[in-house]
Amino acid sequence: KKVVLGKKGDTVELTCTASQKKSIQFHWKNSNQIKILGNQGSFLTKGPSKLNDRADSRRSLWDQGNFPLIIKNLKIEDSDTYICEVEDQKEEVQLLVFGLTANSDTHLLQGQSLTLTLESPPGSSPSVQCRSPRGKNIQGGKTLSVSQLELQDSGTWTCTVLQNQKKVEFKIDIVVLAFQKASSIVYKKEGEQVEFSFPLAFTVEKLTGSGELWWQAERASSSKSWITFDLKNKEVSVKRVTQDPKLQMGKKLPLHLTLPQALPQYAGSGNLTLALEAKTGKLHQEVNLVVMRATQLQKNLTCEVWGPTSPKLMLSLKLENKEAKVSKREKAVWVLNPEAGMWQCLLSDSGQVLLESNIKVLPTWSTPVQP
C-alpha cells in the first residue's frame, strides 16, 4: 500500500494509473467504500462523501490512462485509505495529513517560549525535527518547545515530519520582538551631550505600547524613573519626564533619548522597557553611561571615570606625544606636580581608546585651562 503525506490546508494529488492509455471508467472510494468521485464517459461524477466540494480530478489526464484524486484544503480527518477502482483492479493509497502550528502567535517577545504543536491522524507515530534560522536543531513528538527565544531565532523555522520513511516539510515564520542590542554602553566626557538610541529588531505595520526608562546612577542608592512615554502607530509622545536630568525624546522610531550633559552624578545603568499592546511581557534594553573628568587642583592632576566600567579597562594619564605617566586598572589616576603641556586622560580596552579627555596644564604661576 502506497503512503502519501499531506499538509493541513494544502492540496494533495493521489495517483491512479490504468494499463490502457485511454479514458476508461474509474472510481475513487474511501475505506468505508463510499464513493468520492468517478467518471461517466467524459463527465466527472461525485459521490456522497464528506470530500464532495473539495474533491476533484484532472480530466485532461484521463485519455492517458491517469485518473488522479485531488483533495483541496486538506484536513487531518481526511487521513484515510483511498481506493481507486479501475480495470477490475484496486489501487490503495494511504493518506496521512499533518498540521503544525505555533502556540497562540508567531510574534513572540525575546525570552518567551515557542511551542510547536503537531496535529496528526490517530494511529500515526510521527517524529518531528525543526531547524531554527540560526541552525539549531530540536526534535520531538507531538509538541516541540524552545524556551528563552533569542533575536537570532527570528525568521523561517523549517520542520520535517517523518512517518513511514516519508517526510513532509513545514515552514513557519517566527518574529522575535526585541531591541537590536540587549545592552549598549556610551562613553562621554563630562559636559558632553549624550545620545541614547534603542532601535528595534523588527518591523510591524502598527506599533502601539508604552515605555519607561529607569536609571540607577552609580552614586545613588536607588533607581529612579527618568522618563515615561507612549507609542501610538510608531509615533512617540512623552508622558512624564524628571526635571533633573531633563531628557528629550525623539517623536519617531527608533526610540531616541538625549541627555543634555554628561555629569558624574548621571553615570550608571538604565533599563528601557517597552510594553507592546496585546502582548504579555516587555522588551528590555540596558544602557550604560560612563563619564570621564580630568581636573587639576593645585599640584594634582586627576583623571576619573564614573559608571559601569569593566575591570579589563585601563585608565591612563599622559603628556601629549609622550609615554603614559600612569596607567592602571582603576577608576581614578593622578599625577603630582605635572609638567606644563597638554595632558590626555585615556580610558582604553586592550589598547583601544574608548574615551579621551584633554586638559592643558599651564606653568605653575597660571591656572589650568580646559579645552
Epitope: P311, D349, G351
Partner: antibody, heavy 120, light 113 residues
C-alpha cells in the same frame, strides 16, 4: 580549537629589522587583543606591547618605543611584530600571546615562539 | 614600573609533597575600584611556551588540575602545588597586569628531590 602559529626562526645582523608573524585560528580574531612577549636564552619573560585587532590600535612598552611596530591583517587573521635597529641583546624567542577573557592582561593562548638570533 | 620578585629561584620537592612559590610586587596590584588582584601564574616547560594556570591571583584556568592553587592579595602572592607530580617539573612565573608595562617575575624552577 584556538591556535596561534608563528613564522620560522630568523638570523639577522645588528642594525637590521625582523618581522615575525602570528596567524590566529579557532576564534573570532577581532575579539581578542594580541600581545608580544620575548624571552632571551635562559632568561625570564618580557612584555613588549599589545595590538587590538579590531581597530589596529597599539600600546608599546617604553623600552621598545620607537623600535617596535605591531600591525595586523584581519583578512588573514594575522598579527605582525617588527623590531628594528636590532642588537645582540635582542636575541630571544618571541611569542605572540592572546589576551584572556577575564582581566585583559593574562594570556590564555601562546604561539609556539620564533627564535630571532642577532649576530654579526 | 611594577617589579615582581619571585622566591625561591629554584625548589626541589619530593613527589607527592607540597611546593610553594612566592611572588612579591613592588606596589599593590589590588585594584581599589574593582577589588581584584591583577596577578597571573604560568608554567613553562623546556622548549614550550608558557601555559596559564591562575588569573585574578586565585582563579584556576579551565583544565588546570586542582592541585594548583593561587592565593594572596595586595603585594604578596603564592602559588601552591599541593602534591607534586613528575609532570609539574617546570619553571613557574608570576605576572602583574594591573599597570602597564605588564611585568613578570624572574621565575622559579621546580625540580624533584
Amino acid at each position: 580549537q584556538v591556535q596561534l602559529v608563528q613564522s620560522g626562526a630568523e638570523v639577522k645582523k645588528p642594525g637590521a629589522s625582523v618581522k615575525v608573524s602570528c596567524k590566529a585560528s579557532g576564534y573570532t580574531f577581532t575579539s581578542y587583543a594580541m600581545n608580544w612577549v620575548r624571552q632571551a636564552p635562559g632568561q625570564g619573560l618580557e612584555w613588549m606591547g599589545i595590538i587590538n585587532p579590531s581597530g589596529g590600535s597599539t600600546s608599546y612598552a617604553r623600552k621598545f618605543q620607537g623600535r617596535v611596530t605591531m600591525t595586523r591583517d584581519t583578512s588573514t587573521s594575522t598579527v605582525y611584530m617588527e623590531l628594528s635597529s636590532l642588537r645582540s641583546e635582542d636575541t630571544a624567542v618571541y611569542y605572540c600571546a592572546r589576551e584572556g577573557d577575564y582581566g585583559s592582561g593574562e594570556f590564555d593562548y601562546w604561539g609556539q615562539g620564533t627564535l630571532v638570533t642577532v649576530s654579526s | 614600573d611594577i617589579v615582581m620578585t619571585q622566591s625561591p629561584d629554584s625548589l626541589a620537592v619530593s613527589l607527592g609533597e607540597r611546593a610553594t612559590i612566592n611572588c612579591k610586587s613592588s606596589q599593590s596590584v589590588l585594584s581599589s575600584s574593582y577589588n581584584k588582584n591583577y596577578v597571573a601564574w604560568y608554567q613553562q616547560k623546556p622548549g614550550q611556551p608558557p601555559k596559564l594556570l591562575i588569573y585574578w591571583a586565585s582563579t584556576r584556568e579551565s583544565g588546570v588540575p586542582d592541585r594548583f592553587s593561587g592565593s594572596g592579595s595586595g603585594t604578596d602572592f603564592t602559588l601552591t602545588i599541593s602534591s607534586l607530580q613528575a609532570e609539574d617539573v617546570a619553571v613557574y612565573y608570576c605576572q602583574q597586569y594591573y599597570s602597564t608595562p605588564l611585568t613578570f617575575g624572574g621565575g622559579t624552577k621546580v625540580e624533584i628531590k
